[in-house]
């Protein structure tokens, strides 16, 4: 059952697991819910009748009824994690906690105009996980402005003190805000030499990684495959660090993979949800329960019902016996990781999908699409929509892509002469548009947010926000597609598509079938060279053959210029302008994307 | 089912104002863009503005814009348009059409206004 | 704005008849064109909408097509209670406009 409220003057006896400090019960509840165990905590907050060195506590606890006793106590504070709820979770905690000093390492200090100069420096330093920020007004002088950048083993505070005129907070980096580069590759047969800070076990390097990127003081890591000579070492995950933050040196050895954290890319990558199943490999750990399943993925469904399963096996049944139904073991262990991985011994198993929610639903896989042809198929692009105006008559007027369960993103020109947001409708989950009939469901706007610097297509800031009235309930026909990390600038894209019900040739009309074009990317040297009346800016993408044939056209304006990179599809443009449609060495121009996550961030996630 | 019911004939003098009314029932009345038409004795349709009631956002054929009024009260579900400085080319029979989903489905019965000294 | 030129203005035709009724759009319009009945005394009543989607109730003899510039109104077998003005009307673009009508009698 899913409990979000806070019980105050309230603590939860026994059951304790383990105590961290954190600033607000607010932050309690997304630690316990981020630990693999916690199903509870009690927090103190500060109060006279409180001893100061409990203030601030939070005491993670599980109990195997999922309940524990309530005892009242003044100034405590208890809960539920958000394990037991279905909804979206996020560790992303943008708080500024006044006059609270929250004790860490202090491995860096200079100075900074503002705590949130502060809290941008802390976002974009990997080792940081905190910050505390001595203000223009605090008593020491030389302390003044003065920014601290800490780090803890376990990225919570080792302490939290009252302190006047500081300010404390958090690394966005779980926002999505960090501009540390995303480095996805994994290096076949490379040791990473540097120190261990943890080790667990894992079924593949992938889930290693996984484990990596959601452990707090890993930075990279190397996994040691089945077939890895030392047996004792099979299947080891080796969590690691450094001061500079990279591997100070990489070993040749067969068998074993490295590879580095994803935690500037995690919002666009899953990172909790280890999907796979894992046949003829037995996960051992402490049996929570046994019970009859049809098959590996019901034991799977079985276990993320279970809130406090993390692991299972399956052992298949043997010829006719217990009507076909199998045995699924139910697991969990101290870190939620196998205690140790078999093979050969005929099991199937895997994880929980229940810590799938804690990763951005656009990294869910959607089907496999249909190679070639210019039609779509149902739920190949589940994050495109059709956005329609009802003036003069209703009909499409651009593209979008959903980006959040509120949020489309779309081309600023697409709303020249739309006096209101209340005229237009989105409809999503849409192939064909004779599907919109007069009783087809929609999502009413409720805002248009333009970029305030955005004056016309082609001299860029060509992007736009629409805030829908109602949210949108994710399916396979409707979800959202992953904005680009701010990592990945970098990244070559080599898979992109361009789609939309727009024009196939200049003088046409809107097509009734969504279309789709596979168009390569143009460096904006290129680009720039086609169009030399035109500033082609760092803020726009260009994409074209130079030959022509493939582009976007009229009323494909807004749509996503979609790229698949590491199985995951990021919003890398959106239709903006181009001389005519199609024509050769005349480009499509696009707003470019990862230029505009933080615009993007900023307002989708105001208060 | 979808009814728009006018306001019944004027007569009016020339210089004079008229507001005309038009209640909707049966549909969600916010939901839908409301037109008006002209349509002179003998003549055919003359498209004069059309609102948004929802929004209050209004469209005016250039030739209305300074006289023609639109308002919508979304309380009563009811659309007005008044007419002022009124001469006697503005004779006609006035309607209120719904735009549905692709074109104007219902219709008002239509008022008569008749402008003489 | 764009100009709706209907033709003919009039015309007389026998019950059973094909009656064909055309509308030139000065400028293209797509498919965004209605056609609409009007009988004396009576408001006009919406017999096609996107050129060529027959409205709810309206008699299947009633049909119509074109795009961009050029529309036509057919009536495959003309009937009595046929007779009416009729006029198409763009939904295009502000200003919206209609034809100057083709009132239809019968012979």
């Known amino acids: 059952e899913c409990v979000t409220q806070l019980l105050k003057d309230t603590c939860f006896e026994g059951g304790d697991i383990t105590t961290v400090f954190t600033p607000s019960a607010k932050y309690c509840q997304v630690v316990c819910t981020y630990h693999p165990r916690c199903l509870l905590f009690t927090f103190t907050a500060e109060s006279p009748s409180e001893d100061p060195t409990r203030w601030f506590t939070c005491v993670l606890k599980d109990s195997v009824t999922e309940t524990l006793p309530r005892v009242n106590r003044t100034a405590a504070i208890s809960g539920y994690s958000f394990k037991q709820c279905s909804h979206q979770i996020s560790a992303c905690n943008k708080d500024i906690y006044v006059d609270l000093d929250m004790k860490g390492i202090n491995y860096n200090s200079s100075v900074a105009k503002s705590a949130q100069e502060c809290q941008e420096r802390c976002t974009d330093d990997v080792h940081c996980h905190f910050f505390t920020y001595a203000t223009r007004q605090f008593p020491s002088l030389e302390h003044r402005n003065i920014c601290l950048l800490k780090h803890t083993q376990t990225g919570t505070p080792t302490r939290i003190t009252k302190l006047d005129k500081v300010v404390s907070g958090f690394s966005l980096k779980s926002c999505a805000l960090s501009n540390l580069a995303c480095i996805r590759d994994i290096f076949p047969n490379t040791v990473f030499a540097d120190s261990n800070i943890d080790s667990v076990m894992a079924p593949d390097a992938f889930v290693c990684g996984r484990i990596c990127t959601h452990h707090p003081g890993c930075l990279f890591f190397t996994f040691f495959s089945q077939e890895w000579p030392k047996e004792s070492q099979r299947n080891l995950c080796l969590l690691k660090t450094s001061e500079s933050g990279l591997p100070s040196t990489r070993i040749k050895k067969s068998k074993a993979l490295s590879g580095f954290s994803l935690q500037s890319c995690r919002h666009s990558i899953p990172v909790f949800c280890h999907s796979s199943f894992y046949h003829d490999t037995d996960f051992l750990g402490e049996e929570l329960d046994i019970v009859a399943a049809k098959s590996h993925e019901a034991c799977q469904k079985l276990c993320t019902n279970a809130v406090r399963c993390q692991f299972f096996t399956y052992t298949p049944a043997q010829a006719s016996c217990n009507e076909g139904k199998g045995k699924c073991y139910l697991k969990l262990s101290s870190n939620g990781s196998p205690t140790k991985i078999l093979h050969g011994r005929g099991g199937i198993s895997g994880y929980t999908l229940r810590l799938c929610k804690m990763d951005n639903e656009c990294t869910t896989k959607i089907k496999p699409r249909i190679v070639g042809g210019t039609a779509s198929v149902r739920g190949e692009w589940p994050w495109q929509v059709t956005l329609h105006t009802t003036s003069p008559t209703q009909r499409h007027l651009c593209g979008g892509s959903i980006i959040g369960n509120q949020w489309i993103l779309t081309a600023a020109h697409c709303f020249y002469g739309v006096e209101s947001p209340k005229i237009l409708r989105v409809y999503s989950g849409i192939l064909n548009q004779s599907e919109i009939k007069e009783d087809t469901s929609f999502f009413g706007v409720q805002e248009i947010i333009i970029h305030d610097q955005y004056k016309m297509a082609e001299s860029g800031y060509d992007i736009a926000l629409l805030k829908l009235e109602t949210t949108v309930n994710y399916t396979d026909s409707q979800r959202p597609i992953c904005l680009p990390s701010k990592g990945d600038r970098n990244v070559i894209y080599t898979d992109c598509w361009v789609t939309g019900w727009g024009y196939r040739k200049l003088r046409d009309k809107i097509q009734n079938t969504l279309q789709k074009a596979k168009i390569p990317l143009v460096t904006n040297e290129e680009c720039q060279k086609r169009y030399r009346g035109h500033k082609i800016t760092h803020k726009m993408i260009c994409a074209g053959y130079r030959e022509g044939g493939k582009d976007a056209c009229k009323g494909d304006s807004g749509g996503p210029l979609s790229c698949k990179h590491n199985e995951v599809w990021h919003l890398v443009g959106i239709t903006s302008w181009g001389e005519g449609c199609a024509q050769r060495e005349r480009p499509g121009v696009y707003t470019n994307v990862v230029e505009y996550v933080d615009w993007i961030l900023e307002k989708t996630q105001a208060v | 089912q979808v009814q728009l019911v006018q306001s019944g004939s004027e007569l009016k003098k020339p210089g004079a104002s008229v507001k005309l009314s038009c209640k909707a029932s049966?549909?969600?009345?916010?939901?839908?863009?409301m037109h008006w038409v002209k349509q002179a004795p003998g003549q055919g349709l003359e498209w004069i503005g059309n609102i948004y009631p929802d929004s209050d956002s209004t469209n005016y054929d250039e030739k209305f814009r300074t006289r023609a009024t639109l308002t919508a009260d979304t309380s009563t579900s009811t659309a007005y348009m008044e007419l002022s400085s009124l001469r006697s080319e503005d004779t006609a029979v006035y309607y209120c059409?719904?735009?549905?989903?692709?074109?104007?489905?219902?219709w008002g019965q239509g008022t008569t206004v008749t402008v003489s000294s | 704005d764009i100009v709706m030129t209907q033709s003919p203005s009039s015309l007389s035709a026998s019950v059973g008849d094909r009656v064909t009724i055309t509308c030139k759009a000065s400028?293209?319009?797509?498919?965004?064109v209605s056609w609409f009945q009007q009988k004396p005394g009576q408001a006009p009543k919406l017999l096609i909408y996107?050129?060529?989607n027959r409205y709810t109730g309206v008699p299947d003899r009633f049909s119509g097509s074109g795009s961009g510039t050029d529309f036509t109104l057919t009536i495959s077998s003309l009937q009595a209670e046929d007779v009416a003005t009729y006029h198409c009307?763009?939904?295009?673009?502000?200003?919206?406009?209609f034809g100057q009508g083709t009132k239809l009698e019968i012979k």
């Open positions: 009307g763009q939904s295009y673009s502000y200003p919206l406009t």
């Open positions: 059409t719904r735009m549905g989903f692709y074109a104007m489905d219902y």
């Open positions: 996107g050129a060529s």
């Open positions: 049966g549909y969600t009345f916010t939901r839908y863009w």
């Open positions: 400028e293209n319009v797509v498919t965004y």
